[in-house]
């Protein structure tokens, strides 16, 4: 069964936390539907974001922050590992210094942390997706 | 009660005939949600569009057309009516020379047609956006 | 073995124009974010501003903006810091600094420090 | 305005513990370091994201942070660590700043 979009739920990541996503593009890649994850520093989604990741399919990924209400510098990635109307699955793993990304299993992109994932209180996955899995895994300690 | 999203309908306009679509940004403005509303020549989404109208909620609407499956030249407006948070009701009507966009009663866009209103043969909205109401009336002849 | 050698300071006077350079060699200059250090006679150590790896993101200490501009040149492996309309408390000696990855990241600190070059500001 | 307060001295005995405070950084979000700077010579990194060791640093060098307050810690401390410590954290992540500086003396 369908999940919300937007879907927000609340986290808490560290190193070896890995965050879950199943879904499947609303629209054909000729008509550029998005996809964007946010790890947000408090509930509220006007707040700080520490890891944004966008999909615009079939053309880009960019990466970013938002500190103190302001974007910083964006990474941008012509890999597009996603498939024209496929489900998707999408890992995002908390290494000690950066995020990895992960399609299908393959690795895609990283993005250095700026911001502690420590710091992050929510995740939300939202725009033109249908939404069918999203699950945080913690480190067994 | 909500519309699906995205919403679409078959739909033959003329001069006089008016899209009138009322819905809600999903997410405040801080985070761009988007509003896209396609006027298609065919009922599939791949199909070409011969009056595409999309907001970034809070930055632009850009407006444009796809012809033989390619974008053509972009008319670009910082004219920013909509309210953060708030509903919207947006009325597109079909004169004999452009299209003029209402908000909230305002006029606030028009463009140029390129392509007779009379190829079209399908509307699509869709974005972040919840959908309340999708009217298409047509000029008593 | 990574080197970043400074040169361009001197004695100014108060209003006037300095440009720094940096030449760097021992790595790939290219790849990696830069800054300018800057530390008083005695005292201690603020940082003045950085710049990307590819050059299109800058930032700047509040004190120096609008007055001082960062830049590179990867082909030449040198940074730069223009630096006008200057004031007796930009006196200091000037550190170029390499950053361990492409971004400004405050993340890997500053791996490489230069010698310093000293600018004096005084009529 | 964002400040980094270190305490300007600390003195410690030949063979032990210094601990050198940072405090008012946001290190709940954002990493700190520390460079040993001694007199005439450029600053050199000791500590990078909280606790990492760049090679070449002797292993008694270590870091930590909580909340508030980062701190350095010098376990067994030798003559030659005598020097000038800096605190660095960012203010975002593009944007950097450095702590007062403190004087560690070894007795």
């Known amino acids: 069964s369908l999940l919300p979009v937007p879907y927000t739920e609340a986290a808490s990541l560290s190193t070896g936390s890995t965050v879950t996503i199943k879904g499947r593009p609303l629209a054909c890649f000729l008509n550029e539907p998005y996809l964007q994850v946010d790890f947000h520093t408090e509930m509220k989604e006007e707040s700080d974001i520490v890891f944004h990741f966008q999909v615009c399919f079939g053309r880009r990924v960019v990466m970013n922050s938002r500190e103190y209400g302001a974007w910083k510098q964006q990474v941008e990635s012509k890999n597009m590992p996603f498939q024209d109307g496929q489900e998707f699955e999408l890992s995002i793993s908390v290494l000690p210094d950066k995020y990895q990304v992960m399609v299908n299993g393959q690795s895609s992109y990283t993005f250095d942390h700026r911001i502690k994932p420590e710091a992050v209180k929510m995740v939300q996955v939202w725009r033109d997706i249908s939404l069918t899995k999203f699950n945080v895994s913690y480190l067994k300690r | 009660s909500l519309l699906p999203v995205p919403y679409t309908e078959a739909a033959s306009l003329s001069t006089g005939s008016t899209v009138t679509i009322k819905g809600r940004p999903l997410a405040c403005f801080l985070n761009e949600p988007y509003l896209q509303v396609d006027f298609h020549t065919e009922m599939k989404e791949e199909s070409d569009i011969v009056f595409h109208f999309q907001v970034c909620f809070g930055r632009r609407v850009v407006m444009n057309s796809r012809e033989y499956g390619a974008w053509k030249q972009q008319v670009e407006s910082k004219n920013m009516p909509f309210q953060d948070g708030q509903e919207f009701e947006l009325s597109i009507s079909v004169l004999p020379d452009k299209y003029q966009v209402m908000v909230n009663g305002q006029s606030s866009y028009t463009f140029d047609h390129r392509i007779k209103p009379e190829a079209v043969k399908m509307v699509q909205v869709w974005r972040d956006i919840s959908l309340t109401k999708f009217n298409v009336s047509y000029l008593k002849r | 073995e990574v080197q970043l050698v400074e040169s361009g300071g001197g004695l100014v006077q108060p209003g006037g124009s300095l440009r720094l350079s940096c030449a760097a060699s021992g790595f790939t200059f290219s790849s990696y974010a830069m800054s300018w250090v800057r530390q008083a006679p005695g005292k201690g150590l603020e940082w003045v501003s950085a710049?990307?790896?590819?050059?299109?993101?800058?930032s700047y200490v509040d004190s120096v903006k609008g007055r001082f501009t960062i830049s590179r040149d990867n082909a030449k492996n040198t940074l730069y810091l223009q630096m006008d309309s200057l004031k007796p408390e930009d006196t200091a000696v000037y550190y170029c600094?390499?950053?361990?990855?492409?971004?400004?990241?405050?993340?890997?600190?500053?791996?490489?420090w230069g010698k310093g070059t000293l600018v004096t500001v005084s009529s | 305005n964002f400040m980094l307060t270190q305490p300007s001295a600390v003195s410690v005995s030949l063979g032990q513990t210094a601990r050198i405070t940072c405090q008012g950084g946001?290190?709940?979000?954002?990493?700190a370091s520390w460079y040993q700077q001694k007199p005439g010579q450029a600053p050199v990194l000791v500590i990078y994201?909280?606790?990492g060791r760049p090679s070449g640093i002797p292993e008694r060098f270590s870091g930590s942070s909580s909340g508030d307050t980062a701190t350095l810690t010098i376990s067994g401390a030798q003559a030659e660590d005598e020097a000038d410590y800096y605190c660095q954290s960012g203010s975002s992540s593009d944007n950097t700043v450095f702590g007062g500086g403190t004087h560690l003396t070894v007795l």
């Open positions: 600094t390499k950053y361990s990855g492409p971004e400004l990241n405050t993340q890997y600190g500053m791996d490489y």
């Open positions: 946001n290190f709940g979000s954002y990493y």
């Open positions: 994201r909280d606790s």
């Open positions: 710049i990307n790896s590819g050059g299109g993101w800058t």
